[in-house]
């Protein structure tokens, strides 16, 4: 049995502009004020960190300036958006939530959201 419960959608289709959004929801056992959210990508048994943000409850998520992720929080829900996706980025994106402060520390891992990215067809040249 996993530790803290984390729920996320099974499948999301990225937009034609390479943007995918999904909600990561966790069942908090305590009254955490500081939460860390990490998005991990799993492909061929390799797991890489896509982005991470630590936020204070009630405040906005702050990702690094060069991050491909943005997000907002509302209670125990985090709305995550990943941009700049290409077809080669199709894969399983796992939401990891850590309740950092105050003690106790709780960790939860979602089952992952399969994000499908389809590169847009190039516009045909028009002879006008």
């Amino acid at each position: 049995c996993k530790a803290m419960h984390v729920a996320q959608p099974a499948v999301v289709l990225a937009s034609s502009r390479g943007i995918a959004s999904f909600v990561c929801e966790y069942a908090s056992p305590g009254k955490a004020t500081e939460v860390r959210v990490t998005v991990l990508r799993q492909a061929d048994s390799q797991v890489t960190e896509v982005c991470a943000a630590t936020y204070m409850m009630g405040n906005e998520l702050t990702f690094l300036d060069d991050s491909i992720c943005t997000g907002t929080s509302s209670g125990n829900q985090v709305n995550l958006t990943i941009q700049g996706l290409r077809a080669m980025d199709t894969g399983l994106y796992i939401c990891k939530v850590e309740l950092m402060y105050p003690p106790p520390y709780y960790l939860g891992i979602g089952n992952g959201t399969q994000i499908y990215v389809i590169d847009p067809e190039p516009c045909p040249d028009s002879d006008f």
Partner: antibody, heavy 115, light 107 residues
Framework: EVKLDETGGGLVQPGRPMKLSCVAS????????MNWVRQSPEKGLEWVAQ??????????HYSDSVKGRFTISRDDSKSSVYLQMNNLRGEDMGIYYC??????WGQGTLVTVSA | DIQMTQSPTSLSASVGETVTITCGTS??????LNWYQRKQGKSPQLLIY???NLADGMSSRFSGSGSGRQYSLKISSLHPDDVATYYC?????????FGGGTKLEIK
């Protein structure tokens, strides 16, 4: 100051029951998943059981070695957690620690199983 | 169940040295790993949580690192007070298995 006080250990015959208690203070007990962990020279530290809190409907989890014999329970109004141990075996011997989500630990109580 | 393989089982080092203890897991535990210090005759004490975070009141000479299936605990500038047995533990999922422990002694 955080305190966890375990009681109830001692000498017990194989096959007999024993109940351990742990009273906590100094932290918000209801926010914590409470666990029992035991320590023996043969097995080192071994997680035994966990009881989660109200948001998790007081779910219980056990190690395979004690499943069906041990029962963990809690009383948030008394900031207490219990371990009812039935049909005790030699391999259950050790120091039993009560721990709040592994952040805070009690001093331990020794359980000896012998005829 | 997740298996924890801790090494070495014992370690002897001199005051001022830096030592490293490693913990391997049978599957990816996504950083769900704690380290504990247990001194002779005392209860275990949380040292590092979530693989890299130092627990309140613990010396900054202790640091944790790792991800996936491989983790390590580093003790810098060894003190005589660091004599203890150190354990890693999976906290991602039940059963919350512990490593076999590393007994640290001072030369």
């Amino acid at each position: 100051e955080v305190k966890l006080d375990e009681t109830g250990g001692g000498l017990v015959q194989p096959g007999r029951p024993m109940k351990l208690s742990c009273v906590a203070s100094g932290f918000t007990f209801s926010d914590y998943w409470m666990n029992w962990v035991r320590q023996s020279p043969e097995k080192g530290l071994e997680w035994v059981a966990q009881i989660r809190n109200k948001p998790y409907n007081y779910e219980t989890h056990y190690s395979d070695s004690v499943k069906g014999r041990f029962t963990i329970s809690r009383d948030d109004s008394k900031s207490s957690v219990y371990l009812q141990m039935n049909n005790l075996r030699g391999e259950d011997m050790g120091i039993y620690y009560c721990t709040g989500t592994f952040a805070y630990w009690g001093q331990g109580t020794l359980v000896t199983v012998s005829a | 169940d997740i298996q924890m393989t801790q090494s070495p089982t014992s370690l002897s080092a001199s005051v001022g040295e830096t030592v490293t203890i490693t913990c391997g897991t049978s599957e990816n535990i996504y950083g769900g790993l704690n380290w504990y210090q247990r001194k002779q005759g005392k209860s275990p004490q949380l040292l590092i949580y979530g693989a890299t975070n130092l627990a309140d009141g613990m010396s900054s000479r202790f640091s944790g690192s790792g991800s996936g299936r491989q983790y390590s605990l580093k003790i810098s500038s060894l003190h005589p007070d660091d004599v203890a047995t150190y354990y890693c533990q999976n906290v991602l999922s039940t059963p919350y298995t512990f490593g076999g422990g590393t007994k640290l002694e001072i030369k």
